[in-house]
């Protein structure tokens, strides 16, 4: 789903139709470029595969919150 329209910008044109288990997600980045047709979130899974998701969906927002908290909590 991410398409590199140039070296700097990656766009999403479709979103996953699935709620993905947060345990499978490693990180995310937001796509907000005006060069892209829609705002998106690209999740990277624990096996480094990328998935475009709709930032308006609650599970996407919850997953981003979860990943943010993981990042803020130092591992002992």
């Amino acid at each position: 789903q991410p398409d590199a329209i140039n070296a700097a910008v990656t766009c999403c044109y479709n979103f996953t139709n699935r709620k993905i288990s947060v345990q499978r997600l490693a990180s995310y980045r937001r796509i907000t470029s005006s060069k892209c047709p829609k705002e998106a979130v690209i999740f990277k899974t624990i096996v480094a595969k990328e998935i475009c998701a709709d930032p308006k969906q609650k599970w996407v927002q919850d997953s981003m919150d979860h990943l943010d908290k993981q990042t803020q909590t130092p591992k002992t």
Epitope: Q1, P2, T16, R18, K19, S21, Q23, R24, I51
Partner: antibody, heavy 122, light 107 residues
Framework: EVQLVQSGGGLVQPGGSLRLSCAAS????????MSWVRQAPGKGLEWLAN????????YYVDSVKGRFTISRDNAKNSLYLQMNSLRAEDTAVYFC???????????????WGRGTLVTVSS | AIQLTQSPSSLSASVGDRVILTCRAS??????LAWYQQKPGKAPKLLIY???SLESGVPSRFSGSGSGPDFTLTISSLQPEDFATYFC?????????FGGGTKVEIK
């Protein structure tokens, strides 16, 4: 080891029923969609059905809708295919497969069972 | 349902040859296309997903390209273990569908 181990195939008469099982190990089964795919002798692959992580959402191909039921038991790390009203044309090797999300769509398969043969004949 | 047509249905090639397999979709599937290798009596093995992404552990001599209706799988230098049947699969929409396969045989 990450694997899917299948069981339950065999010979069944037309109109009969059979239940296939697929036991997952080496990964967190409850985090993944799962699918069944079949292959008639000497033929190509046909996707049959898939099921969401908690079993709440399921999709089927028209040729098995109403006759086959996909289910799962996450406590047992197991996937099932209940096949009823079997026909000769259902004779095939049946594979279970782990079903992943892609970039522009959902539903490709990165891990497969070895397959189990179902023969429908009188 | 989206139909996938693979060509050729079979081909003969020699070790070291560059081999190109094609898969044409009856309607647009964006980049939602995967390629699998299957050997007799075995389960299929994922090679390529998202039209061009190489699955982990798959040799770099395999590559995928294309979008819209036409996709290709290229084997840059055919190895003895590559003689098998190759299937494409679309995951753009339900029902998920496979192509009829291309059998790569030894010349």
């Amino acid at each position: 080891e990450v694997q899917l181990v299948q069981s339950g195939g065999g010979l069944v008469q037309p109109g009969g029923s059979l239940r296939l099982s697929c036991a997952a190990s080496g990964f967190t089964f409850s985090h993944y969609w799962m699918s069944w795919v079949r292959q008639a002798p000497g033929k190509g692959l046909e996707w049959l059905a898939n099921i969401e992580q908690d079993g709440s959402e399921k999709y089927y191909v028209d040729s098995v809708k109403g006759r086959f039921t996909i289910s799962r038991d996450n406590a047992k790390n197991s996937l099932y295919l209940q096949m009823n009203s079997l026909r000769a044309e259902d004779t095939a090797v049946y594979f279970c497969a782990r079903d992943l999300e892609g970039l522009h769509g959902d539903g490709y398969f990165d891990l497969w069972g070895r397959g189990t043969l179902v023969t429908v004949s009188s | 349902a989206i139909q996938l047509t693979q060509s050729p249905s079979s081909l003969s090639a020699s070790v070291g040859d560059r081999v190109i397999l094609t898969c044409r979709a009856s309607q647009g599937v964006s980049s939602a296309l995967a390629w699998y290798q299957q050997k007799p009596g075995k389960a299929p093995k994922l090679l390529i997903y998202d039209a061009s992404s190489l699955e982990s552990g798959v040799p770099s001599r395999f590559s995928g390209s294309g979008s819209g209706p036409d996709f290709t799988l290229t084997i840059s230098s055919l190895q003895p273990e590559d003689f098998a049947t190759y299937f494409c699969q679309q995951f753009n929409s339900y029902p998920l569908t496979f192509g009829g396969g291309t059998k790569v045989e030894i010349k």
